[in-house]
């Protein structure tokens, strides 16, 4: 916030020596000193920290304080901690005072010191040790202290040193106005301050080229009776293919772009897009490359991803598991999955056509994170062509080819379905008769049905099986009075079926020759 | 114009005792501590202490506590070195030098004329 | 205690020539370094406190620098009444001497 100060005194602006005013002459000592940038400088010393009940007074030369109704006093000192100073800590100090005295005209060399109007007393902020000034490790306390309103045509300004060891290396005395600004790219022009000290007053600012008041935000600022710019309240923004540039804004170059007002900074066309004039908000992608729906301006333009690599499969009987690298190129995005399509096709013309509903995939069909599949379900000894497509947000946009890996293979024979549908026909003391239904998918020629079964509280730890040709049987040499779990598969060339769910059967008590249906106490189903 | 002043040379017999003055004029005596430095013939320079003149407090450097001891007569700003149990060795001149401490970093800036003492048999 | 070396023990230089004295503490005294000049017959004479500020009076040909350790004082035109012996001093908790320089004619 610029705050114009019209000097009245600068110290370090001095080369000759300052010859103030020192009482006693013992006291304050004007000596060449070096400022924080290491420039030499006049500076006034004074290190009287053996004695109590020190009273070293330092005065300026008349000051004239031009038109300014306001004061402000700027001083840079550095003052030594006191523990840094060997045998001095009941008479060393760590503050001195500042004073001031106002006046019409120069009143001479003569300090009276009761006229003196003391304006504060001043501490560091920051004192050194030894070692710090070792290092070279001037801390520089800066404290600014106004005076006024001031009545008279100019003034003194005196520094009373009570027992520190201070170097006063610089004075600076000004007073300020509110002088033109760019602000938030805002123009603020010169302003009179307020003529109270409390005041203030509202300006409101013009936004500067190729700029626009944030909404519902325009800009103002207040001047105050210090001379400085306060509280800004609103501003101007670069609109959208402009950036700001100091107190301006300026249009992107070429391959640049700015799509809101709200961004701030061009920014470099992302990767495959480009924009061929200055002042651009967004930028085109090039030929092959888009960007998704939902993707924001400042991402790179895509392509679609290249194929699958190495595409392998492994067939079992109905089932496939195919099986991918990731391709070449994922066309510069990370979104990228998969798809499967399945087309079964005939033995004479090569004709293929998709594969329908009744294909099982497992984890899924579309939208694949992982590299891998299995397709279930497949009809056996047929012909198939699997294509495993890799797809990202962008390869809906695209008009060129598919890239996919493809793979066709045939299937073998599958072991036949489930038996469904046993019954018990008849249930004696010693034997139990059992009908059931042919597999729904038989997949081949059933050439017999196996059935097992032992003892329920024996659970399957000794069983027996008995085969035949046939969807029924009779099972004999059983205990009477016993349960029986029975459990049924059918077998073809391919192999073993799945037994079909658990079917419990009591026998006949021995002394009982009265013949009825034992009834079924559970039903599970048991894998092979 | 400040000065340190000392007396002229001493001439001591071993076991005995010497006591140096330094009279200061030219600026406010208990402003600035006194230090004391001892040069023996043909040698550097050895600070031996210094001493507060505002509180009397005396420093001594190693090797010089015991028979050295410093001391003031603030009315006639003197300070004092006194030596006793004198030894052949501690044949040498004996500045005073008054200490300065500045924001900047401390010195002796102020050096008595010396005085010599000579510990002969 | 804290022993300061001075380098070389004796520097022989022509009237208008530049002289370069050193002097190395056994270990960090920050700049808490004084230097100063002795001539025959002379109590010696503060030249550099603070590692580096001249005192009111001192001509600007004498300058220093350093801190830590390793500390310079530099003559850039020795005048004729510039052969002395100069000896450093630093004050830390206990004040030592270097054992001195003698600047003599070439």
């Known amino acids: 916030q610029a705050a114009k100060e019209v000097l009245l005194l600068d110290s370090k602006a001095q080369q000759t020596e300052l010859e103030w005013i020192s009482s006693p002459p013992s006291g304050w000592e004007e000596i060449s000193g070096l400022d924080e940038n290491y420039t030499p400088i006049r500076t006034y010393q004074v290190c009287q920290v053996m004695e109590p009940n020190q009273n070293n007074w330092l005065r300026t030369n008349w000051i004239s304080k031009g038109n300014a109704q306001r004061i402000f006093v700027e001083l840079k000192f550095t003052l030594r901690d006191c523990n840094s100073l060997p045998g001095v800590l009941g008479t060393c100090k760590e503050t001195f005072n500042l004073y001031y005295y106002e006046t019409d005209y120069d009143t001479g060399r003569n300090i009276r010191e009761n006229l003196y109007v003391k304006i504060d007393t001043i501490a560091a902020d920051e004192s050194f040790t030894q070692g710090d000034l070792g290092e070279r490790k001037m801390k520089l306390n800066t404290e600014v202290r106004e005076i006024g309103p001031l009545s008279k045509k100019g003034f003194y300004l005196a520094f009373q040193d009570v027992g520190a060891c201070i170097a006063l290396v610089s004075v600076k005395v000004y007073y300020k106005k509110c002088w033109s600004i760019v602000e938030n790219l805002a123009v603020f022009p010169d302003t009179v301050t307020g003529s109270e000290f409390s005041s203030l007053v509202e300006v409101r600012g013009t936004c500067v080229s190729s700029a626009e008041e944030e909404a519902e935000n325009s800009p103002r600022m207040h001047c105050s009776a210090e001379g400085e710019w306060l509280v800004p309240i609103g501003k101007c923004i670069c609109k959208a293919g402009y950036q700001q540039k100091g107190d301006t804004c300026e249009p992107c170059g070429r391959r640049f772009y700015k799509s809101s007002s709200q961004d701030l900074q061009c920014s470099r066309c992302p990767t495959h897009s480009f924009s061929d004039r200055e002042g651009s908000s967004r930028c085109e992608c090039e030929d092959g490359y888009y960007r998704a729906p939902s993707d924001p301006p400042y991402v790179a333009c895509t392509r679609p991803p290249s194929a699958p690599q190495n595409l392998i499969f492994n067939i079992n009987q109905t089932t496939v598991s195919l099986e991918w690298s990731p391709p070449a190129d994922n066309g510069g995005r990370n979104d990228v999955t998969y798809r499967i399509l399945c087309k079964r096709c005939s033995w004479e013309q090569g004709e293929c056509v998709p594969c329908g509903s009744n294909i099982g995939y497992m984890p899924q069909q579309t939208g694949l994170e992982d590299n891998y599949v299995t397709v279930m379900d497949l009809l056996a000894h047929a012909n198939y062509t699997f294509e495993v497509e890799a797809v990202n947000g962008v390869s809906d946009l695209s008009r060129s080819q598919r890239l996919f890996a493809a793979v066709s293979i045939t299937t073998g024979q599958a072991a036949p379905s489930q038996v469904s549908g046993v019954m018990k026909e008849r249930v004696l003391q010693r034997s139990v008769q059992l009908s059931w239904q042919e597999p729904e998918h038989p997949n081949g020629v059933i050439t017999e049905y196996e059935i097992k079964y032992y003892e329920k509280d024996q659970r399957e730890r000794t069983y027996s099986t008995l085969k035949t040709k046939s969807t029924s049987a009779s099972i004999n040499n059983l205990k009477p009075g016993t349960v029986y779990v029975f459990q049924i598969r059918a077998v073809t060339a391919a192999g073993y079926g799945n037994y079909s769910p658990r079917l419990d059967v009591a026998t006949l008590e021995e002394a009982s020759g009265k013949m009825f249906e034992a009834t079924a106490v559970s039903s599970e189903q048991n894998p092979v | 114009q400040v000065q340190l002043l000392q007396s002229g040379a001493e001439v001591k017999k071993p076991g005995a005792s010497v006591k140096v003055p330094c009279k200061a004029s030219g600026y406010t005596f208990t402003s600035r501590a006194m230090s004391w430095v001892r040069q023996a013939p043909g040698q550097g320079l050895e600070w031996m202490g210094w001493?507060?003149?505002?509180?009397?407090?005396?420093t001594y450097a190693q090797g010089f506590t015991g028979r050295f001891v410093f001391s003031l007569d603030t009315s006639v700003s003197t300070a004092y070195l006194q030596i006793s149990s004198l030894k052949a060795e501690d044949t040498a001149v004996y500045y005073c030098a008054r200490v300065r401490f500045t924001v900047y970093g401390d010195g002796m800036d102020v050096w008595g004329q010396g005085t010599l003492v000579t510990v002969s048999s | 205690e804290i022993v300061l070396t001075q380098s070389p023990a004796t520097l022989s230089v022509s009237p208008g020539e530049r002289a370069t004295l050193s002097c190395r503490a056994s270990q960090s005294v920050s700049s808490n370094l004084a230097w100063y000049q002795q001539k025959p017959g002379q109590a010696p004479r503060l030249l550099i406190y603070?590692?580096?500020t001249r005192p009111t009076g001192i001509p600007d040909r004498f300058s220093a620098s350093g801190s830590g350790t390793d500390f310079t004082l530099t003559i850039s035109r020795v005048e004729p009444e510039d052969f002395a012996v100069y000896y450093c001093?630093?004050?830390?908790?206990?004040?030592?001497f270097g054992q001195g320089t003698k600047v003599e004619i070439k």
């Open positions: 603070g590692a580096s």
């Open positions: 001493i507060n003149t505002n509180t009397g407090n005396p």
């Open positions: 001093q630093q004050y830390g908790p206990s004040w030592t």
